[in-house]
């Protein structure tokens, strides 16, 4: 299953499959997730080691048993790949690292006014993988405000050095934020020239394209079909690059297919997995296990659950079957692709779904790095769980926020439905940033069921929580994915990095905002909160947040939206925006429904018809 815990001051011994330099443990974990054989990783921060060559070292590891012995190493961080972790799987990495220079091939230098502008330039350059920016206080005046765009053979820095007044980061192309745009078309009977960066076997051109999209240096590809004239080259997928970023030439060639990486697509990237099953096809590879199962779909599920399995073949040969069950061959290879593809066999083959974003319903998100009063504009994909609850009567308007917590579930405040309990009038918009982008053609979700907490009473502050079941499940993308729920009765965690988001008023007597706002607000103890609200009962099922001096808060229109806190690299839904005295007033914190106190209720109500929870808190 999905293991998200990190081990501090621990290093896994042995099992090395690759090593590289990464700026932090989260990026190292992401590289492990996308490496075909990596199950475990260990990372050495600069502070953990004197050896300059090993500083920022990221060590990717495999193990037949799924684990390795841990040795104590001060400062080291170790953990697991996020394969099988559903919507937590993302190649998107937004963080900017201060005081760090990520080295690589510098291919473009320009003057810019901020590190954000430098990151944007990198994201909008087809070859840029990462960048470094010299701030205005950099010691050499001639380098100040320099933005260096970089690449490397593996997509990670060739070295990382601690350097004052330098800030570094990665391209946001994997976040689907590139302005370049992409070529969706595939060209039949056409071969591209230029440099081959890798060669894999794939059953069709679409799998070849997805592999190209997630390969650090692939910009375009040529696929040789299963009827290509040279037998040894059939089903070969050549991943390619060029100096210019586009093919320098193309040749008409029967039974070849060419196309482009989709990494530069805006707003939508293909999933990093291949879910299609290929009947009549055998995938060859190293044998991991053989098991008898009933049906090819069960074979695929078995492969997906066995974390080291990369692909499978389900044999329908009479000698491989007994009763209704047949042999399911679970296989792997060095590069994650079959070592042989054979057609016209009595088998069906496919890939593990361990890297599918939509994966398992029962895990929670770690990713992403009332208007809000005193807030700032959010950016695309920053809060992908935030939804807008809108009512359409004669006109349509935003009324409340909400949080996506599963494919078909939104968590919000019960008071949003005061006087509007009819599910037909509601429209739920997800994956949006600007309310002005909503037109009559913008897709929205309709409500199948509104579940208001049984103890909620109108105009009382208690039990202000409601679940919305959507009529149809939503697919997860970089801009639309769920927030992790806290553990039941979570009281031990001390949250220091909490944010409230919403489109609500920017002042008490204001109006709904166009761009989703965010504000960083500290949590306040319930004792402190009770002192500020002597006319109300602040219960253990509430959580408060706000600045003593006021100025930053949720406000009308933010209700039902999330109060999220980041802990150990993972965002959790700590509160639901509920009530407060005015907005952002001095010594009047906002009051939020404490989600951890309602975990039993949430899990009970979200049981699917087969009795399996649709979402779950971290173990």
């Amino acid at each position: 299953g999905c293991l998200t815990q990190l081990y501090e001051n621990a290093f896994f011994r042995g099992g090395d499959v690759a090593s590289m330099y990464t700026p932090n443990a989260q990026y190292c974990q992401m590289r492990c997730t996308f490496h075909p054989r990596c199950l475990l990783f260990s990372f050495l921060p600069a502070s953990s080691i004197n050896d300059m060559e090993k500083r920022f070292g990221c060590f990717l590891k495999d193990s037949v048993t799924g684990t390795l012995p841990k040795v104590h190493r001060t400062g080291a961080v170790s953990g697991h790949s996020l394969k099988q972790c559903g919507h937590q799987i993302s190649a998107c990495h937004r963080d900017i690292y201060k005081g760090v220079d990520m080295r690589g091939v510098n291919f473009n230098v320009s003057k810019v006014s901020s590190v954000e502008e430098c990151q944007k330039r990198c994201t909008s350059n087809i070859r840029c993988q990462f960048f470094s920016y010299a701030t205005q206080t950099f010691h050499k005046a001639e380098y100040r405000n320099n933005c260096l765009l970089k690449y490397s053979p593996g997509g990670t820095p060739t070295a990382i050095k601690v350097l004052s007044n330098v800030e570094s980061g990665f391209s946001l192309k994997p976040c689907a934020l590139s302005e370049i745009g992409c070529h969706m078309n595939i060209f039949q009977h056409l071969a591209f020239s230029d440099v081959d960066v890798a060669r894999v076997l794939t059953p069709d051109a679409f799998v070849c394209r997805t592999i190209c999209t997630y390969h650090p240096n692939c910009l375009f590809f040529t696929f040789y079909t299963n009827v290509w004239k040279i037998e040894s080259q059939r089903n070969v997928c050549l991943l390619k690059t060029s100096e210019s970023g586009t093919p320098s030439s193309s040749t008409p060639q029967e039974n070849t297919i060419s196309g482009y990486s989709l990494l530069t697509c805006k707003r939508t990237l293909p999933e990093p997995c291949h879910s299609k099953i290929y009947p009549g096809v055998d995938f060859g590879g190293e044998e991991l296990n053989v098991t008898f199962v009933k049906g090819v779909n069960v074979c695929q599920e078995t492969c997906t659950k066995m974390i080291r399995c990369q692909f499978f073949t389900y044999s329908l040969l009479p000698e491989d079957c007994k009763e209704e069950k047949c042999k399911c061959f679970l296989r792997l290879s060095m590069d994650g692709s079959p070592t042989r593809i054979a057609y016209g066999t009595q088998g069906s083959s496919g890939y593990s779904l361990r890297l599918c974003n939509t994966g398992d319903n029962s895990v929670c998100t770690t990713k992403t790095s009332t208007r809000i009063v005193g807030g700032t504009n959010s950016s695309w994909g920053e809060w992908p769980w935030q939804v807008s609850l809108q009512v359409k009567l004669t006109a349509q308007r935003h009324l409340c926020g909400g949080s996506l917590i599963g494919h078909q579930w939104v968590l919000t405040a019960a008071h949003c439905f005061d006087g509007l309990p009819l599910q037909d009038v509601w429209r739920i918009y997800s994956g949006i940033l600007n309310l002005s982008d909503i037109t009559k053609d913008t897709p929205f979700s309709q409500i199948k069921e509104i579940i208001i907490h049984q103890n909620y009473k109108v105009s009382e502050g208690n039990h202000d929580i409601a679940l919305i079941k959507l009529q149809a499940p939503l697919n997860y993308t970089e801009f639309q994915k769920p927030i992790c729920l806290p553990s039941k009765g979570d009281t031990s965690t001390i949250y220091t990095n909490c944010w409230v988001t919403g489109w609500g008023f920017s002042k008490e007597k204001g109006e709904i905002q166009n761009i989703l706002q965010k504000v960083n607000i500290p949590l306040v103890t319930n004792e402190e909160c009770q002192k500020r609200y002597q006319d109300y009962k602040i219960t253990q099922r509430m959580v408060c947040a706000g600045y003593k001096e006021g100025g930053k808060d949720a406000c009308k229109g933010d209700s039902g939206g999330p109060l999220v806190c980041k802990h150990n690299g993972m965002w959790r839904l700590v509160g639901i925006t509920s009530w407060g005295e005015g907005c952002a007033r001095r010594e009047q914190p906002g009051v939020y429904t404490k989600v951890a106190e309602y975990m039993d209720w949430i899990l009970e109500k979200t049981q699917s018809s087969d009795g399996k929870a649709q979402m779950q808190s971290p173990a």
């Epitope: 051109a205 879910s275 009549g280 016209g344």
Partner: antibody
């Protein structure tokens, strides 16, 4: 030029049999997955059966399973569909189609042959 | 089996009009979506494969788009020779299934 030419259609009584043929030219027939698709009068398209190049793997729609048999003779560049126990609902134009597995489509189709099952 | 729902079932448009046909699938089919054109009394012909890629010889006035479960075929400028029936097909999961068709006529 890729060409597919069906033959063997006609009028047959319910319970009767018919064998359709599809002669292929203009490509290396022995390398391609082939399929039969049918279209009832005034209706949409329905996949009937598929066969891999070697003939080692065949599959059928539930509606024809156990009654129809797909086969091929790569030396004659010909695809066949043996239809037994025919029913009125099998009345349709039958098309043979080549499959491009590299992009998963039916890139070339024959002109079709009409099968009428009626008493 | 994956269900394919095409809309509209028929449409009438003028020459040079922009025409859009929609195809919805009962589950995510990734990019395994093809479009075919069938002239009256003729065999189907492949227009677009993999959602948006034109088959060789097909006019660039045809284009395809979409993702996951919702797809569209667009004819940017309808021509008299475009009359006939258009079918979508999913090739993601066996059995491959077709939409019920959209009949296009000239006003």
């Amino acid at each position: 030029e890729v060409q597919l030419l069906e033959s063997g259609g006609g009028l047959v009584q319910p319970g009767g049999s018919l064998r359709l043929s599809c002669a292929a030219s203009g490509f290396t027939f022995s390398q391609y997955l082939m399929m039969w698709v049918r279209q009832a009068p005034g209706k949409g398209l329905e996949w009937v059966s598929s066969i891999y190049p070697s003939g080692g793997y065949t599959s059928y729609a539930d509606s024809v399973k156990g009654r129809f048999t797909i086969s091929r003779d790569n030396s004659k560049n010909t695809l066949y569909l043996q239809m037994n126990s025919l029913r009125a609902e099998d009345t349709a134009v039958y098309y043979c189609a080549r499959v491009s597995t590299a992009v998963a489509d039916n890139d070339y189709w024959g002109q079709g042959t009409l099968v009428t099952v009626s008493s | 089996d994956i269900q394919m729902t095409q809309s509209p079932s028929s449409l009438s448009a003028s020459v040079r009009d922009r025409v859009t046909i929609t195809c919805r699938t009962s589950q995510n089919i990734n990019t395994y979506l093809n479009w075919y054109y069938q002239a009256p009394g003729r065999a189907p012909k492949l227009l677009i494969f993999g959602v948006s890629s034109l088959h060789r010889g097909v006019s660039s006035r045809f284009s395809g788009s979409g993702d996951g479960t919702e797809f569209t075929l667009t004819i940017s400028s309808l021509q008299p020779e475009d009359i006939g029936t258009y079918f979508c097909q999913q090739s993601y999961s066996s059995p491959w299934t077709f939409g019920q068709g959209t009949k296009v006529e000239i006003k």
